[in-house]
C-alpha cells in the first residue's frame, strides 16, 4: 500500500486498539483516551499530563457529549493535530516542497 | 516516531508533494489533487479516473468555493475515507478487537 | 469567581419569540466549557433547553429544537438564546450555567434566573 | 431521553438526623451522576458530580453512591441550612435530564 493509504489505516487500527480495551468497544472513554494519547502521541502531549489537562481535551473532543469519544470524534481531533503540524511545516520554507 | 505520529506526518508531507508543483504552494488545485488521488490514494480511486467524477470531488471538497483545496478541506476528505475505511473494519468482528 | 448574568424581556406574548442574554463574567468565555440554558417549569420540574460549547458546537433539546436558536459572542463574553413561537407551556424562570469539563460534564456555576411569562 | 425518578418527593426531618435521598435512571448512566441543591427563590448549586465527588466549598457532610441505574445521596448529619430541594442530573447524555425533586423540610 502507498504511504497515505497505510497512515489511514494505522489511523483506524490506533484507534480501535485502545477502544477496544473497555467500555463501548467502538468509543474511547478518558482512560483509554489517556492510554492512547501517552503511548501513541507522547510528541503531543508532551509534559502535559495532569488530570485537568486530560479533562479539558476529552470535553473538547467529546462534541456529542457522551463522556466518550467515537471515531469521528478521534478523527476531528487527529486533523487538528495535522494541522498544528502543516502550520509548523509552512513556517519553515527550508522543510518546504520547492517553490511554485 | 510512533506509527500515529508517523502517520499524520505522512498526512502533512504528502500534501506538499502535491501542492507544491503549481500555482499556491499551500493549495492543492484539480491538477495536483488527481495526482495526488491517482499516486496516493489508488484504492479509494478505483477505476474512477472520468472527468466528472474528478470536478464533482473537487467540488464536494472545495468548501470555501476557491477552486482549490487546502489543507483543512484535505484534513477532512482524509477523515471522511477514514470513516469509511472505519466502518468496514467495524462491519467484520473477526477484524475487530478483543470483545470488551 | 465566575458570574453569570441573565437579561431578557419578562414578558413575551404567545406566537412572538423569547430572547434572552447571558454575560459571563470573572471568566474568559474559554472553549474549555459549554454554556447552558436551562428552565424552571412553575411546577419546579427542570428542562434542559440546550448549550454551545467548543468551536460553536451547539447541542438542543430536540423536544425544542424546532424553535430554538442560540448564539455567542465571544468579544462580548455572551451567549444567547431566541425560542420561537412561544406559547403559555414556555413561562418559566430561565437559567443560564456553565458546563464544567469534569466527568459528567457538570453544571457548577449557574445564573441568578429570570422569570419569563408568556401572555397576551 | 433517559428517566431520572427521584424519591421521596419530600420529607421531613431534624437538624444532626442522617437523611438519604435516592434517584433512579431509566437505563445505565455509568456514574455520570450529579447532585443540586436549591432554596427558595435561587437558583441550583452544584453539591456532587460523577456520583461521589464533591464539588468545591461543599461540606463533607453531603456525599454520593451508586452505579448503574441507582443512586444516592446521604446528608450525614444534617444542619439548618440544608433545608431545601436536591435535584439529581444524569450527565451520561443528550439530553440532559433531572429528577422531580426532594423537598427536605423540619419536622
Known amino acids: 500500500a502507498c504511504p497515505l493509504e497505510k497512515a489511514l489505516d494505522v489511523m483506524v487500527s490506533t484507534f480501535h486498539k485502545y477502544s477496544g480495551k473497555e467500555g463501548d468497544k467502538f468509543k474511547l472513554n478518558k482512560s483509554e483516551l489517556k492510554e492512547l494519547l501517552t503511548r501513541e502521541l507522547p510528541s503531543f502531549l508532551g509534559k502535559r499530563t495532569d488530570e485537568a489537562a486530560f479533562q479539558k481535551l476529552m470535553s473538547n473532543l467529546d462534541s456529542n457529549r457522551d463522556n466518550e469519544v467515537d471515531f469521528q470524534e478521534y478523527c476531528v481531533f487527529l486533523s487538528c493535530i495535522a494541522m498544528m503540524c502543516n502550520e509548523f511545516f509552512e513556517g519553515f520554507p527550508d522543510k518546504q516542497p520547492r517553490k511554485k | 516516531a510512533c506509527p500515529l505520529e508517523k502517520a499524520l506526518d505522512v498526512m502533512v508531507s504528502t500534501f506538499h508533494k502535491y501542492s507544491g508543483k503549481e500555482g499556491d504552494k499551500f493549495k492543492l488545485n484539480k491538477s495536483e489533487l488527481k495526482e495526488l488521488l491517482t499516486r496516493e490514494l489508488p484504492s479509494f480511486l478505483g477505476k474512477r479516473t472520468d472527468e466528472a467524477a474528478f470536478q464533482k470531488l473537487m467540488s464536494n471538497l472545495d468548501s470555501n468555493r476557491d477552486n482549490e483545496v487546502d489543507f483543512q478541506e484535505y484534513c477532512v476528505f482524509l477523515s471522511c475515507i477514514a470513516m469509511m475505511c472505519n466502518e468496514f473494519f467495524e462491519g467484520f468482528p473477526d477484524k475487530q478487537p478483543r470483545k470488551k | 469567581q465566575v458570574q453569570l448574568q441573565e437579561s431578557g424581556p419578562g414578558l413575551v406574548k404567545p406566537s412572538q419569540t423569547l430572547s434572552l442574554t447571558c454575560t459571563v463574567s470573572?471568566?474568559?468565555?474559554?472553549?474549555?466549557?459549554?454554556w447552558n440554558w436551562i428552565r424552571q417549569h412553575p411546577g419546579s420540574k427542570l428542562e434542559w433547553i440546550g448549550h454551545i460549547g467548543y468551536g460553536g458546537n451547539i447541542n438542543y433539546n430536540p423536544s425544542l429544537k424546532n424553535r430554538l436558536s442560540m448564539s455567542r459572542d465571544t468579544s462580548k463574553n455572551q451567549f444567547s438564546l431566541k425560542l420561537s413561537s412561544v406559547t403559555a407551556a414556555d413561562t418559566a424562570v430561565y437559567y443560564c450555567?456553565?458546563?464544567?469539563?469534569?466527568?459528567?460534564?457538570?453544571?457548577?456555576?449557574w445564573g441568578q434566573g429570570t422569570l419569563v411569562t408568556v401572555s397576551s | 431521553d433517559i428517566q431520572m425518578t427521584q424519591s421521596p418527593s419530600s420529607l421531613s426531618a431534624s437538624v444532626g438526623d442522617r437523611v438519604t435521598i435516592t434517584c433512579r435512571a431509566s437505563?445505565?448512566?455509568?456514574?455520570?451522576l450529579n447532585w443540586y441543591q436549591q432554596k427558595p427563590g435561587k437558583a441550583l448549586k452544584l453539591l456532587l458530580y460523577y456520583t461521589s465527588r464533591l464539588h468545591s466549598g461543599v461540606p463533607s457532610r453531603f456525599s454520593g453512591s451508586g452505579s448503574g441505574t441507582d443512586y444516592t445521596l446521604t446528608i450525614s448529619s444534617l444542619q439548618p441550612e440544608d433545608f431545601a430541594t436536591y435535584y439529581c442530573q444524569q450527565g451520561n447524555s443528550l439530553p440532559r435530564t433531572f429528577g422531580g425533586g426532594t423537598k427536605v423540610e423540619i419536622k
Open positions: 450555567t456553565r458546563e464544567s469539563f469534569y466527568d459528567g460534564y457538570p453544571f457548577d456555576y
Open positions: 437505563q445505565d448512566i455509568r456514574n455520570y
Open positions: 470573572g471568566d474568559s468565555f474559554t472553549n474549555d466549557y459549554y
